[in-house]
Interface confidence: low
Amino acid sequence: KNNVPRLKLSYKEMLESNNVITFNGLANSSSYHTFLLDEERSRLYVGAKDHIFSFDLVNIKDFQKIVWPVSYTRRDECKWAGKDILKECANFIKVLKAYNQTHLYACGTGAFHPICTYIEIGHHPEDNIFKLENSHFENGRGKSPYDPKLLTASLLIDGELYSGTAADFMGRDFAIFRTLGHHHPIRTEQHDSRWLNDPKFISAHLISESDNPEDDKVYFFFRENAIDGEHSGKATHARIGQICKNDFGGHRSLVNKWTTFLKARLICSVPGPNGIDTHFDELQDVFLMNFKDPKNPVVYGVFTTSSNIFKGSAVCMYSMSDVRRVFLGPYAHRDGPNYQWVPYQGRVPYPRPGTCPSKTFGGFDSTKDLPDDVITFARSHPAMYNPVFPMNNRPIVIKTDVNYQFTQIVVDRVDAEDGQYDVMFIGTDVGTVLKVVSIPKETWYDLEEVLLEEMTVFREPTAISAMELSTKQQQLYIGSTAGVAQLPLHRCDIYGKACAECCLARDPYCAWDGSACSRYFPTAKRATRAQDIRNGDPLTHCSD
């Protein structure tokens, strides 16, 4: 593996070469963690402490802000409860989603009293509207956590908010909720560690199963404590959970509870020299690469190790067909003298738990009509026995010999002279961004990773907690506790002044145009353009 970056740029070098624009935060704010990209309006909305920002995608120095603090009473209540006045007793924005054409929906911790509201953004970008609906505040329980330290994953579709969060002051009652909309709120089973066991939610995504929207599923990515017997000692497992979009809860024991919730373990590991696999279990971030077929996005996951002794990070790729295969496989069941987890061998009730009510797979019209045996089975068998293994059964990127860990990932699919390449932008806990290209070898999923760039994007080392990529603007946006940074996806001119250097870089964004290393456009009919991503061979492509 080529672990030395082709380019390593310090913050100073990034500034001097005009390759980074930074918003260094406001004195009375912090925690620029919640991002919402709006390519149509050319805005990046950012939720932070007591503020929501609207940044211009062209240049983040141009921004509008909404101040949304908590009342003195709320702040005092929070303080009396023994919380930190600066780090906890404020309104940390945790949810920021597009509600409709004219409004966003935002939720914050509200000084341990979660609160939500709508933000008016107008019909058109030129309306230049960005204001809080002061008259319409809603209870944020089950939408935002009480504690700003806790992670939340949310998704707003068709006026309904799906969120994975903690629903209580103590931060013990974790659940996946569906709120808003016209239906009764639905949640995962309460106080049942088989469903969720102290989870840390990462993200939520809507993925179609078929051409019938009734089959649409919401997938949650999270990490959680492994259940006793599943693993010796205390361990973390990365998970993917599924819920049918048209799940309206069941009857009796699952009234207002999900009936189609299932979860499976995501494996990201490398074989060790002693025959014991090294597991990267701490899922940190997920990116879905939608290309051609929206039903089958490629899932990119960023993982770190749980161990304090051995620190490492990895990126694993998963296919949705593998995920679906696992959800159609055996359920995990506790049995035997040691009460350990085994694949369930008994009769699975019909319709199979986890199947969405629809015409496609037949059977039933609503989850409320599910037979008792399906409800009972679903309630006690939320986990699948088989895990989901990554494509090629191993990570595509591994970093173990460094003083940092991966925290975030976004991926861009780039057209190059010799094919399409996925370029990963990986954020770290020290404020650097790695730009990595995965290059297919014999088969498209057998990949070689090439580290193109390592860029420091913040003045002080600070963990990157949010990232968005704009293909339209060809820019990357990065969030941390300290502020927001913006950088171009490519810096072709920095690779050098010769064709060979440009070709050796193996950056799919760049090609030698006869006089300089510049942005490669597949549509440009230039016979002189030299680029070789697969092999990085200048001898064949450069005549100078």
Partner: antibody, heavy 116, light 111 residues
Framework: EVQLLESGGGLVQTGGSLRLSCAAS????????MSWVRQAPGKGLEWVSW????????YYADSVKGRFTISRDNSKNTLYLQMNSLRAEDTAVYYC?????????WGQGTLVTVSS | QSVLTQPPSASGTPGQRVTISCSGS????????VSWYQQLPGTAPKLLIY???HRPSGVPDRFSGSKSGTSASLAISGLRSEDEADYYC???????????FGGGTKLTVLG
């Protein structure tokens, strides 16, 4: 048919101990959280304690914290309540109840009398 | 002193409609499901209403539950003599991490 049958109640001196049992049948015991609820003579219901289906978590009312211990044996379909340092105010009928977001089934109760 | 507040007594004549109230706070009724229990003289309590307004099978549709904000109520229509009992509301309390009951309402069927 769901059945819950409590036993182990009786007369005990202040400071003494008792162990209540609740035998469950008619449902998959290991799938459900279970609870104890008590009712002092002529008074209302008071929740005492509850336990996860797998004993993973246990919760107690402040009035019994540190004195009572809830436990279960899923292989025997039995719920227990170990009561130590008993006080006169612990005198009540103790009901075992199946938890399903609420107490959907109750036993007939067993009377515990603490005399001074 | 119960966490949930119920009137100590209520009464009605056969055929009448009676409502029993139960008030709490945002940490219990406001954000959690409410249940109602019926306790006939000398017997164990029985679940009457769960998840605010749902009836378990076997409970007559004369019994109905509703909730608004931090208050809940149980309505009994077409009152019958066999409805004479103690009625308790209950809910999970997030701040106490425990289940709380109302003090109970003794329903008397007159005449």
């Amino acid at each position: 048919e769901v059945q819950l049958l409590e036993s182990g109640g009786g007369l005990v001196q202040t400071g003494g101990s008792l162990r209540l049992s609740c035998a469950a049948s008619g449902f998959t015991f290991s799938d459900y959280a279970m609870s104890w609820v008590r009712q002092a003579p002529g008074k209302g219901l008071e929740w005492v304690s509850w336990i996860y289906y797998d004993s993973g978590s246990k919760y107690y009312a402040d009035s019994v914290k540190g004195r009572f211990t809830i436990s279960r044996d899923n292989s025997k379909n039995t719920l227990y309540l170990q009561m130590n340092s008993l006080r006169a105010e612990d005198t009540a009928v103790y009901y075992c109840a199946k938890l399903n977001g609420d107490f959907d089934y109750w036993g007939q109760g067993t009377l515990v009398t603490v005399s001074s | 002193q119960s966490v949930l507040t119920q009137p100590p007594s209520a009464s009605g004549t056969p055929g009448q409609r009676v409502t029993i109230s139960c008030s709490g706070s945002s940490s219990n009724i406001g954000n959690n499901d409410v249940s109602w229990y019926q306790q006939l003289p000398g017997t164990a309590p029985k679940l009457l209403i769960y998840a605010d307004s749902h009836r378990p099978s076997g409970v007559p549709d004369r019994f109905s539950g509703s909730k608004s904000g931090t208050s809940a109520s149980l309505a009994i229509s077409g009152l019958r003599s066999e409805d004479e009992a103690d009625y308790y509301c209950g809910a999970w309390d997030s701040s106490l991490s425990g289940y709380v009951f109302g003090g109970g309402t003794k329903l008397t069927v007159l005449g």
